[in-house]
Each structure stands twice: as structure tokens, then as C-alpha cells.
């Protein structure tokens, strides 16, 4: 049966025994800046082009053992959430991956900047349809990373990022704090903000909306047919990147402002239990859970 | 995220160093009274001192970026410091990535075209 997260973002009309909006997102290219990925996993084979871009720091620790499946774990899962054949949101979207996170899931602001620059140069050399850039990463507030995101957004690129898993104000992190970026927090099957160990999803006025981010089934790099459940604001951001790809595929001329407005408009309102957030953040945090447009848009989204 | 907000630095540390016009014979001295700022991550364990993103003013051309990077290297060398230009940015932001001692920050902030300098820091999968 349909995984809870796909059911949650699907308009009631389409809640059959399976989630299959055919060819969703086919006009859109989604760039993923993350770890390396297992691009020939059955769930994503042929959908992800691994670029030759790689800018990662060395792994910490002298005894670190580089195991391919672990190196690929985070990125493979997210690629599956965005465009996987059976557990993906935008099954028609094509993706390009850039490696900016090492086998321990760590990268640098500078490496991310160079990755964003690579995307801009690719866009200039070979203009395609709408572009979505997924940044499933977070660091401390960075003026330069936010500035780069702003420039890329002004060039017509839609950037989607994780709010961060620090149970903190997202405005203290980048690229989550960049105003032009769509920043996504994580909720669970009960529409509660996601708790991750002692921490959890970030919140506050720098978050644009929430999306499913707990126990998300997706491609596992352990084997070519494996699936695994992962949690985090990265998974939430991947859902919104997929929804954005489907919206842009249906309406390629949408501006960033219009897309943001549509994401908010079609979100489920006031379903999140705000008691989880600090009192002073409740009024600032949007009570929105991302969803696809309803069946009135059948001809646009499900053709 | 969340359009319409004012830029907020939060705990972000910003060190403002006023440019002093007596810097050693710059051919293109900056406008009087302008300041370039230095930024670093507020979360200490995430800082990566020794690598810096030098961001130049918006209309700076690639050739000027390269020239500014070379000037920094030359001035650093005169002081006995080795530097390495790791990347020259163009396309999104003008600037360059440099590996150097933090001792050179004051010098770097006085270079022509410099808007601000940010110490590199870590980002993490979420």
C-alpha cells in the first residue's frame, strides 16, 4: 500500500491503493547537492545523472573506513524520495547530482558555493527548462552562502533546503535562513514536528512550510533493490522539491514568488501541534504541511 | 526561507575592520571610509580557520578578481606568508577562495573591491 508520506501529500481524489501521477515533473531538472549516490539503484536508474562535480573535505579520524554503501546512503535515499519509481514524489523528474558532502555527511560552505556556481554555469551553457536545486544540508548562518542562493534564485532557479535538525531557530542556519530559498521543516505521520534523538526539526519564521520527514521509505544504497526508512528535514525538503518539480512541469512559467504562493496555498493548514515549539516561536512558525494541488488540476498534474 | 524577513545574523559574529588608507601603496585605493567586514561561524566547532572566501563587490569582473587574488598573494609573500588561491568565483558571486593564515585578514580586508570576507565553515547532511 501507499507509504504514509506519499498519502499525506496526495489530494484525497488520488488516494487509491497506489500513488502514481504519471510522468510528474518531466519538464524539470532537479539538482541534488549531497553525498555520492548509487545512481544505478533500481528505484532511480536512468533518472539521475551523476555530474563530475565533487568538492568535499577529507573524512575525520585516522581509522575512518570508507564503505561505498555508507558514502552513498544519504544522497541515494533523497534521490529516491524526489523521483523514485515506486516511492518517489515526482516520478518523471530527472536529476543531476553534485557531491558536496563526504562519507560522513560533512561538507563546507566553500564547496557548496562552488557547487552552486557550477549549476549556474551549466544553466548558462545549456539552458533547459525549469531548475530546482535541493540543498539537504545545513551549517551555521553564512552571509556568503545566503548571498549565493539569492543570486541563483534571481537567475530563475528554485532552491529548496532543509530547515535543519537542531530543534532551533532556522534563522541561525544557512542556507535555511536565506529569504529566497524555500526552507522546509519536518513533520511525522501524526502531523507532529519531528523529534530526532534529543533534537528535532528547526522552526521559526525562516521556515516556509513543513513536509513529511519521519520514517520515510526510500532507496537504500545497501543493495540495488533495497529500501530503507530515514528521517530528517532533508527528507522533508526532498518532498517539497518533488512537489515543486511537478508544479513547474505543469506550469513552467511560474515565478519563484508564484510557486511559493502555490506551495502555501495547497498546503494543509493548522494541522501541526504547535505545543512542540518554544512558546515565543509558535506564532512565527508557519502551520503548513506541503501537499500536491487537488483534483481540479488533474489535467495539469496527472496527465 | 520565508520571504519578507529582514536579514538576521543571529549569533553570527561580524568583525568590522575599518580600512586604513596608508596601506602599502595600493594602486587602486578603496573609497575613503568604506569598510569591508569579516564574518565567521558562530558555532565554534563548525569553524574552518585557515580557509577564507573573499567576496568582492557586485560588479567586479573576473580579471579584477584574479588581479586582487594575485595582489593578496604578493603582499602576503612580502610579509613572509604563503597563500594558496583554491578557486576564483565568477558567475554567481565575484571573489576567491584562499588558504592563508588568519594573520593576513586585516591585510586582505584592505584590498580593492573587497566587500567582505567569510571564514569557511562546515555544513552537514540533515
Amino acid at each position: 500500500s501507499i507509504p504514509w508520506n506519499l498519502e499525506r501529500i496526495t489530494p484525497p481524489r488520488y488516494r487509491a491503493d497506489e500513488y502514481q501521477p504519471p510522468d510528474g515533473g518531466s519538464l524539470v531538472e532537479v539538482y541534488l547537492l549531497d553525498t555520492s549516490i548509487q545512481s544505478d539503484h533500481r528505484e532511480i536508474e536512468g533518472r539521475v545523472m551523476v555530474t563530475d562535480f565533487e568538492n568535499v573535505p577529507e573524512e575525520d579520524g585516522t581509522r575512518f573506513h570508507r564503505q561505498a554503501s555508507k558514502c552513498d546512503s544519504h544522497g541515494t535515499h533523497l534521490a529516491g524520495v524526489v523521483s523514485g519509481r515506486d516511492a518517489g514524489v515526482a516520478k518523471g523528474a530527472s536529476m543531476r547530482s553534485l557531491r558536496v558532502l563526504n562519507c560522513q555527511g560533512k561538507g563546507t560552505v566553500s564547496g557548496t558555493l562552488i557547487g552552486l556556481e557550477f549549476i549556474r554555469k551549466s544553466q548558462l551553457v545549456q539552458p533547459v527548462g525549469p531548475l530546482v536545486v535541493l540543498l539537504p544540508l545545513a551549517g551555521g548562518y553564512s552571509r556568503v552562502l545566503n548571498a549565493a542562493c539569492q543570486r541563483l534564485a534571481r537567475a530563475g532557479v528554485v532552491l529548496v533546503t532543509a530547515a535543519g535538525n537542531f530543534r532551533d531557530d532556522a534563522c541561525l542556519y544557512s542556507p535555511a535562513s536565506a529569504p529566497e530559498v524555500i526552507t522546509v521543516g519536518a513533520t511525522n505521520a501524526q502531523d507532529q514536528p519531528v523529534t530526532l534523538g534529543t533534537l528535532g526539526t528547526n522552526f521559526g519564521r525562516c521556515v516556509d512550510l513543513f513536509a513529511p520527514g519521519e520514517d520515510i521509505i526510500g532507496a537504500s544504497s545497501d543493495c540495488s533493490t533495497c529500501f530503507v526508512s530515514q528521517s530528517g528535514t532533508s527528507q522533508a525538503a526532498a518532498h517539497v522539491a518533488g512537489i515543486a518539480a511537478m508544479m513547474l512541469s505543469a506550469e513552467p512559467e511560474l515565478t519563484l514568488a508564484e510557486l511559493r504562493q502555490r506551495l502555501i496555498h495547497f498546503s494543509a493548514k493548522d494541522v501541526i501541534n504547535e505545543a512542540w515549539f518554544p512558546e515565543d516561536q509558535r506564532v512565527l512558525t508557519p502551520n503548513l504541511v506541503a501537499a500536491l494541488p487537488p483534483s481540479t488540476h488533474e489535467n495539469l498534474y496527472f496527465q | 526561507g520565508a520571504m519578507g524577513q529582514e536579514d538576521e545574523d543571529g549569533d553570527y559574529e561580524e568583525l568590522v575592520l575599518a580600512l586604513r588608507s596608508e596601506e602599502d601603496g595600493l594602486a587602486e585605493a578603496p573609497e575613503h571610509g568604506t569598510t569591508a567586514t569579516f564574518h565567521r561561524c558562530a558555532k565554534d566547532p563548525w569553524r574552518l580557520p585557515g580557509t577564507y572566501v573573499v567576496v568582492l563587490k557586485e560588479e567586479t569582473h573576473l580579471s579584477q578578481s584574479e588581479r586582487t587574488a594575485r595582489r593578496l598573494q604578493a603582499q602576503a609573500a612580502r610579509r613572509g606568508y604563503l597563500t594558496k588561491i583554491l578557486h576564483v568565483f565568477h558567475g554567481l558571486l565575484p571573489g576567491f577562495l584562499v588558504k592563508m593564515s588568519g594573520d593576513l585578514l586585516e591585510l586582505a580586508l584592505k584590498l580593492p573591491h573587497v566587500d567582505y570576507i567569510e571564514e569557511d565553515s562546515s555544513v552537514f547532511a540533515q
Epitope: E18, Q20, P22, Q38, S39, D40, R42, E45, G46, V48, M49, V50, A68, R85, D86, K91, C223, S224, T225 | -
Partner: antibody, heavy 115, light 109 residues
Framework: QVQLVQSGAEVKKPGASLKVSCKAS????????ISWVRQAPGQGLEWMGW????????NYAQKVQGRVTMTTDTSTSTVYMEVRSLRSDDTAVYYC????????WGQGTTVTVSS | QSALTQPASVSGSPGQSITISCTGT?????????VSWYQQHPGKPPKLMIY???NRPSGVSNRFSGSKSGNTASLTISGLQAEDEADYFC?????????FGGGTKLTVL
């Protein structure tokens, strides 16, 4: 254009080993693995397994596990399948195909096992 | 014994429509979006006609369409033509592998 080119026909004795090659071109090799499928005379298609061009990982069908080894040589973009301890019921046309989706097929390699 | 069940043969006259069924279980056809259909002419390798239940690769005639309901997938060929005479195989993912149907011989009368 996307192409898979296989090695030529083979005649083998029972108990011998067989190695078929499949050279890929015209696409990003790491974006797809290679599946191997065989078809006995007048019969249907049988999936034998898959190998990753990205990391060499394999996924064998239970029926042939232990008797089949798939390998890859990334320097030449060539994938190999070796079948050991051949029997007469291994007589078939062996195909390589791109990925699990099998959207592009090789021309086939006819293998006859006979004493 | 193939994992997926197809009729051994179907036939139709030129211009007619025919449908070939492919029945599996909730562990294969019913559980995945990845049902494919292949056409095979004698002495030739199979050719992909439909992938992921209902998608046509570029170059394949729009006379070919696919659908799925529960554990059964179907291939429909409309406006039957002489060159459609061939064997047709369905395939599906399973949790760890791939399975094919036994094949259906299509005769154009």
C-alpha cells in the same frame, strides 16, 4: 546512440564454463547496471541477474546463484557473465540489457551445450 | 512455470484492438509501478514497448498502451497491423529480482 554489443556464438561441452561479454556505449554507464536474460529455444525469457556498473555489486536470480558470476571492466565499458558447470538445459540465447528497466538489449549470444 | 501468467495466444484482424493480460500477485505486479511489456519478432532481441505500467518509450507507436488494475496488467494494441504479429512478454519487479510472463503469441489474421 545507445548500444550493447555482445560476443559471438559458442558451442560448449557439458561441465565446461562459458564467458559472454557485453560492451556498452552511448550513455552514462554509471546511471544503469546491466541485466542478463536468457531464452531457451522456443521458450520464454528468464532473468538471470544484474550487475552495477557503478560499484560492481551483483544481484543474482536464486536459480543460478552459485553457478553464475558477473563482472565489469569499467576501463573498457564491458560487462561479463560467466556460467560454470554447463548443462544441456543451459542451451539458450543469452542477452544483456540495460538496467533493471531493460530498455536497450544486446543482439544476443547463442550458446549450445552439447556432448 | 513463469511467475506471471499470460494467455498463450491471442489473435485479431487488421484494424481491430486486442488486449493481452498479465496476472501476478501483490508481491510483483500489484506491489510495484514497474510493469514492462516487450515485443519480440523471431530471431530478434526483445524490444521495450511499455515501461512503468503505461509509459511509451520514444519511437513506439501510440497504438500501444498499458494499464494496471490490482494484480493484473494489460497491454492494448489498437488499429492492429500485420507487423504487430510477434511474441509479447510482460515483466515486473519483485522485492529482489525481476520476473517475466510466459509470453503471448499475437497472430494478425
Amino acid at each position: 546512440q545507445v548500444q550493447l554489443v555482445q560476443s559471438g556464438a559458442e558451442v560448449k561441452k557439458p561441465g565446461a564454463s562459458l564467458k559472454v561479454s557485453c560492451k556498452a556505449s552511448g550513455y552514462s554507464l554509471t546511471s544503469y547496471g546491466i541485466s542478463w536474460v536468457r531464452q531457451a529455444p522456443g521458450q520464454g525469457l528468464e532473468w538471470m541477474g544484474w550487475i552495477s556498473a557503478y560499484n560492481g555489486n551483483t544481484n543474482y536470480a536464486q536459480k543460478v546463484q552459485g553457478r553464475v558470476t558477473m563482472t565489469t571492466d569499467t576501463s573498457t565499458s564491458t560487462v561479463y557473465m560467466e556460467v560454470r558447470s554447463l548443462r544441456s538445459d543451459d542451451t539458450a540465447v543469452y542477452y544483456c540489457a540495460r538496467g533493471y528497466g531493460m530498455d536497450v538489449w544486446g543482439q544476443g549470444t547463442t550458446v549450445t551445450v552439447s556432448s | 512455470q513463469s511467475a506471471l501468467t499470460q494467455p498463450a495466444s491471442v489473435s485479431g484482424s487488421p484494424g481491430q484492438s486486442i488486449t493481452i493480460s498479465c496476472t501476478g500477485t501483490s508481491s510483483d505486479v500489484g506491489g510495484y509501478n514497474s510493469v514492462s511489456w516487450y515485443q519480440q519478432h523471431p530471431g530478434k532481441p526483445p524490444k521495450l514497448m511499455i515501461y512503468e505500467v503505461s509509459n511509451r518509450p520514444s519511437g513506439v507507436s501510440n497504438r500501444f498502451s498499458g494499464s494496471k488494475s490490482g494484480n493484473t496488467a494489460s497491454l492494448t494494441i489498437s488499429g492492429l497491423q500485420a507487423e504487430d504479429e510477434a511474441d509479447y512478454f510482460c515483466s515486473s519487479y519483485t522485492s529482489t529480482s525481476m520476473v517475466f510472463g510466459g509470453g503471448t503469441k499475437l497472430t494478425v489474421l
